[in-house]
């Protein structure tokens, strides 16, 4: 069984062959970058192999564990503006709302 905060991405009949961090944070745990202009600000989704920056909640048990570089879940572009940024990952910011 996958650890809390993870999901089975590939499974056989009775076991999981590959666990990955659950790729969508619980709505109430999505964290937002601080000191970012609300207007005309974009930021990149986390690179592959990173996980959403979720706080532990009763819904997902604990923060997602790390995963292998072969994680095959990708962020949809339309969701990128609401996606949390892992603190350990480099962040690319572009803002015109200065």
């Amino acid at each position: 069984e996958c650890r809390p905060g993870m999901i089975c991405a590939t499974s056989a009949t009775n076991s999981c062959a590959r666990c990955v961090p659950y790729p969508i944070c619980a709505a109430e745990t999505v964290t937002k970058p601080q000191d970012m202009a609300e207007k005309d600000t974009t930021f990149e989704a986390p690179p592959l192999g990173t996980q959403p920056d979720c706080n532990p909640t009763p819904e997902n048990g604990e923060a997602p564990a790390s995963t292998s570089p072969t994680q095959s879940l990708l962020v949809d572009s339309q969701a990128s503006k609401t996606l949390p940024i892992p603190t350990s990952a480099p962040v690319a910011l572009s803002s015109t709302g200065k």
Epitope: E1, I7, C8, S11, T13, N14, I24, A27, A79, T82
Partner: nanobody, 122 residues
Framework: QMQLVESGGGSVQAGETLRLSCTTS????????MAWYRQAPGNECVLVSI???????YYADSVKGRFTISRDNAKNTVFLNLNSLQPEDTAVYYC????????????????WGPGTQVTVSS
């Protein structure tokens, strides 16, 4: 156990499009995340896509840019648009309820419904 009903599968040629639906009357869809998994004959059950209650979406890299997941909470339905279908997309497609909780233990195909067969020929 909650019963989901998948539909919309069929046999198509490569490059064509299908629209899968997953629905139930037993509960409302506005709470849990929903997911689509698929299983090709003799292969493992593989996560395809997830949609959150508020519409955030995620895709396996094998379908990124070709498949689109959406939901209509008012109609208790989750959709999966399959565009630019390829023979390797041939599988039975299953809808999964609240994968955050229910798809940790392993097998998440055929848990809630019979699935819908998608066959793509070249």
């Amino acid at each position: 156990q909650m019963q989901l009903v998948e539909s919309g599968g069929g046999s198509v040629q490569a490059g064509e499009t299908l629209r899968l639906s997953c629905t139930t009357s037993a509960f409302t869809f506005d709470g849990p995340d929903m997911a689509w998994y698929r299983q090709a004959p003799g292969n493992e059950c593989v996560l395809v896509s997830i949609i959150s209650a508020d519409g955030r979406t995620y895709y396996a890299d094998s379908v990124k840019g070709r498949f689109t997941i959406s939901r209509d909470n008012a109609k208790n339905t989750v959709f999966l648009n399959l565009n630019s279908l390829q023979p390797e997309d041939t599988a039975v497609y299953y809808c999964a309820l609240d994968p955050r909780k229910n798809c940790r233990g392993g097998y998440c195909c055929a848990n809630w419904g019979p699935g819908t067969q998608v066959t793509v020929s070249s």
